[in-house]
């Protein structure tokens, strides 16, 4: 059952795991949810009843039932985990907290201009968990203006005190808004050399990389495969850190494989949610239940339902006993990781699927694509939208994509003349704009947001936002789709596709079915070459062939350029200008997203 | 099952005002523009504009701009049009029409407006 | 403005005659014309709306085909019931604007 509602001057009894230190009760809901075992918890606000060296702290409980006793206690706030609820989650906290010093490792002081710089400066330096900044009014003066930067083993805070004139804050990294490199790439026979910080039992090196990327501590990790030489080191996962933030030593060794944290690129790759099937692989943990179960999918439902199940062990059934049934077993560690990994005794292990709603939407898997062709299938391109203004009558407008349950990204040129969101419908999974009828459920626009350095198409900026007036309820034909990392900037994206309902040619008219042209992205140099009259900035991207022959046209502005990247869509650029449509030495030219992330962000988390 | 109902014949003196009403029922008023057309007698038809009742968009022909002027009443259904400096080439019919999903699907059954000295 | 221009501005057909009213606009429309039929102290009824979808409830042996700058009504077999003025409108642009308008009669 999900509950998310705090209970005020009651305390849980009983069922501690361990006391970590947050700056509200809210926070300390959204680290409990976070934490492996943790079901419920109890938080401790100032008060003058309570002693001070308990205000802040956040007691992280697990009961075999979900529940405890409750008693009354003044400045006691509990609640539960969101991991009972069904609903997206995100460790996103960009709450700034006046006069508390929140303390750890101050490893890092430098001057800021404000709170949100120094805020800014701990998102993008790769150890920086939190951070305390003392104003200007702050009575000693050699500190005034200090930005102190601030880890933890934890990334919680070691203790939280009332200080007068300071601010503390979260890195802002989970929420996307880090500028550091976001390196995806595994490294195959390599160890790195440097200290462990913790180790755990993985099944393979992405999991191993998903698990460093949540771990606080953790910059980068070396796994040891399941042919690694020394019995006792298969299947570990070193999770590492070190001063510089990189690597020091790299070693060649056959078997083990390296990476980075993905931090900087996790809401755009999944890092909770590990979904693959592990097979003639049995996880050994602390044993929750067992259960008949038809399947390994059947199994690992089971788990995802079972709130305290973190992983799972299936022996199919023997012959025809148990009526075709296998053996369910569900299981949990104290880090939610399985103890020990064994091989060759006909297992078929995998993780609880709970832990996905942590990842954005935006990184599940979607339908595999038809190639070749120019006509879309059904819930092949989820994201894809289609506005339609009912002035003078009804018709489709330009493209869009979903980007969050309550939020299209289109762009900005298509609102010319556009006087009222109220004369605007969001259509979404739709593949025919036939499909689409008076009675055709639609999404009302509660706002346009345009990007206020617009002015035309051609000299960039070609961005708006619009606000729906109700969610989007995801499913497999309407789901969002990833914005592009800004640590992805140097990535060359090659498999990328323009879709959209637009013109097949110049003088033509919208299409019925939705279009789709996979085209390769050209250079900004290259692009500038072609446009000598224009200004290609690195706000824009241009993608087309040199030949022409296929392109976006009118009717497909503010649609998608989707670009696959590690199994994972990201929306790359929004179609924008071009000379004509499908001309030879002419590409399309596409506002890039990635530099306008924080515009997104910003226009889209504004409270 | 929608209506479009309109006031009554008006007969006017040069110079002066008329205030036309057309009352919709059957069908969500805010979400459907209404247009508003002038028909001279033998003569064919001729659009003067369009509100939107949920924001009060509206657009004009040019020859009306001037002296046309569209509002609609949200809590009634009720649309409005009202035509000033009236001249003796403003005698029509005048038509409240729906825009439906793609046309101009319901129609007024019309209000005369005469103007003579 | 997009000019639509109709013709015939009047015809005379016998009862089971296969009659053409065409429209041409000025400059390209797309599909955005509807055609719409009154009759004498009547308001127009919608005929044809996206240039040759049928509106419901009006009969089969009226049809509209065309597009971009060239439209036609055609009624396959004149009825008695048909007497009356027809119209063709663009909705492709402001300001929308129609045809003169054609009047039928029966022979």
């Known amino acids: 059952e999900c509950v998310t509602q705090l209970l005020k001057d009651t305390c849980f009894e009983g069922g501690d795991i361990t006391t970590v230190f947050t700056p509200s009760a809210k926070y300390c809901q959204v680290v409990c949810t976070y934490h492996p075992r943790c079901l419920l918890f109890t938080f401790t606000a100032e008060s003058p009843s309570e002693d001070p060296t308990r205000w802040f702290t956040c007691v992280l409980k697990d009961s075999v039932t979900e529940t405890l006793p409750r008693v009354n206690r003044t400045a006691a706030i509990s609640g539960y985990s969101f991991k009972q609820c069904s609903h997206q989650i995100s460790a996103c906290n960009k709450d700034i907290y006046v006069d508390l010093d929140m303390k750890g490792i101050n490893y890092n002081s430098s001057v800021a201009k404000s709170a949100q710089e120094c805020q800014e400066r701990c998102t993008d330096d790769v150890h920086c968990h939190f951070f305390t900044y003392a104003t200007r009014q702050f009575p000693s003066l050699e500190h005034r203006n200090i930005c102190l930067l601030k880890h933890t083993q934890t990334g919680t805070p070691t203790r939280i005190t009332k200080l007068d004139k300071v601010v503390s804050g979260f890195s802002l990294k989970s929420c996307a808004l880090s500028n550091l490199a976001c390196i995806r790439d595994i490294f195959p026979n390599t160890v790195f050399a440097d200290s462990n910080i913790d180790s755990v039992m993985a099944p393979d090196a992405f999991v191993c990389g998903r698990i460093c990327t949540h771990h606080p501590g953790c910059l980068f990790f070396t796994f040891f495969s399941q042919e690694w030489p020394k019995e006792s080191q298969r299947n570990l996962c070193l999770l590492k850190t070190s001063e510089s933030g990189l690597p020091s030593t790299r070693i060649k060794k056959s078997k083990a494989l390296s990476g980075f944290s993905l931090q900087s690129c996790r809401h755009s790759i999944p890092v909770f949610c590990h979904s693959s099937f592990y097979h003639d692989t049995d996880f050994l943990g602390e044993e929750l239940d067992i259960v008949a179960a038809k399947s390994h999918e059947a199994c690992q439902k089971l788990c995802t339902n079972a709130v305290r199940c973190q992983f799972f062990t299936y022996t199919p059934a023997q012959a025809s006993c148990n009526e075709g049934k296998g053996k369910c077993y569900l299981k949990l560690s104290s880090n939610g990781s399985p103890t020990k990994i064994l091989h060759g005794r006909g297992g078929i292990s995998g993780y609880t699927l709970r832990l996905c709603k942590m990842d954005n939407e935006c990184t599940t898997k979607i339908k595999p694509r038809i190639v070749g062709g120019t006509a879309s299938v059904r819930g092949e391109w989820p994201w894809q939208v289609t506005l339609h203004t009912t002035s003078p009558t009804q018709r489709h407008l330009c493209g869009g994509s979903i980007i969050g349950n309550q939020w299209i990204l289109t762009a900005a040129h298509c609102f010319y003349g556009v006087e009222s969101p109220k004369i605007l419908r969001v259509y979404s999974g739709i593949l025919n704009q036939s499909e689409i009828k008076e009675d055709t459920s639609f999404f009302g626009v509660q706002e346009i947001i345009i990007h206020d350095q617009y002015k035309m198409a051609e000299s960039g900026y070609d961005i708006a936002l619009l606000k729906l007036e109700t969610t989007v309820n995801y499913t497999d034909s309407q789901r969002p789709i990833c914005l592009p990392s800004k640590g992805d900037r140097n990535v060359i994206y090659t498999d990328c596709w323009v879709t959209g309902w637009g013109y097949r040619k110049l003088r033509d008219k919208i299409q019925n079915t939705l279009q789709k042209a996979k085209i390769p992205l050209v250079t900004n140099e290259e692009c500038q070459k072609r446009y000598r009259g224009h200004k290609i900035t690195h706000k824009m991207i241009c993608a087309g062939y040199r030949e022409g022959g296929k392109d976006a046209c009118k009717g497909d502005s503010g649609g998608p350029l989707s670009c696959k990247h590690n199994e994972v869509w990201h929306l790359v650029g929004i179609t924008s200008w071009g000379e004509g449509c499908a001309q030879r030495e002419r590409p399309g030219v596409y506002t890039n997203v990635v530099e306008y992330v924080d515009w997104i962000l910003e226009k889209t988390q504004a409270v | 099952q929608v209506q479009l109902v309109q006031s009554g014949s008006e007969l006017k003196k040069p110079g002066a005002s008329v205030k036309l009403s057309c009352k919709a029922s059957?069908?969500?008023?805010?979400?459907?523009?209404m247009h508003w057309v002038k028909q001279a007698p033998g003569q064919g038809l001729e659009w003067i504009g369009n509100?939107?009742?949920?924001?009060?968009?509206?657009n004009y022909d040019e020859k009306f701009r001037t002296r046309a002027t569209l509002t609609a009443d949200t809590s009634t259904s009720t649309a409005y049009m009202e035509l000033s400096s009236l001249r003796s080439e403003d005698t029509a019919v005048y038509y409240c029409?729906?825009?439906?999903?793609?046309?101009?699907?319901?129609w007024g059954q019309g209000t005369t407006v005469t103007v003579s000295s | 403005n997009i000019v639509m221009t109709q013709s015939p501005s009047s015809l005379s057909a016998s009862v089971g005659d296969r009659v053409t009213i065409t429209c041409k606009a000025s400059e390209n429309v797309v599909t955005y014309v509807s055609w719409f039929q009154q009759k004498p102290g009547q308001a127009p009824k919608l005929l044809i709306y996206?240039?040759?979808n049928r509106y419901t409830g009006v009969p089969d042996r009226f049809t509209g085909s065309g597009s971009a700058t060239d439209f036609t009504l055609t009624i396959s077999s004149l009825q008695a019931e048909d007497v009356a003025d027809y119209h063709c409108?663009?909705?492709?642009?402001?300001?929308?604007?129609f045809g003169q308008g054609t009047k039928l009669e029966i022979k």
């Open positions: 996206g240039a040759s």
């Open positions: 059957g069908y969500t008023f805010t979400r459907y523009w």
């Open positions: 509100i939107y009742p949920d924001s009060d968009s509206t």
């Open positions: 029409t729906r825009m439906g999903f793609y046309a101009m699907d319901y």
């Open positions: 409108g663009q909705s492709y642009s402001y300001p929308l604007t």
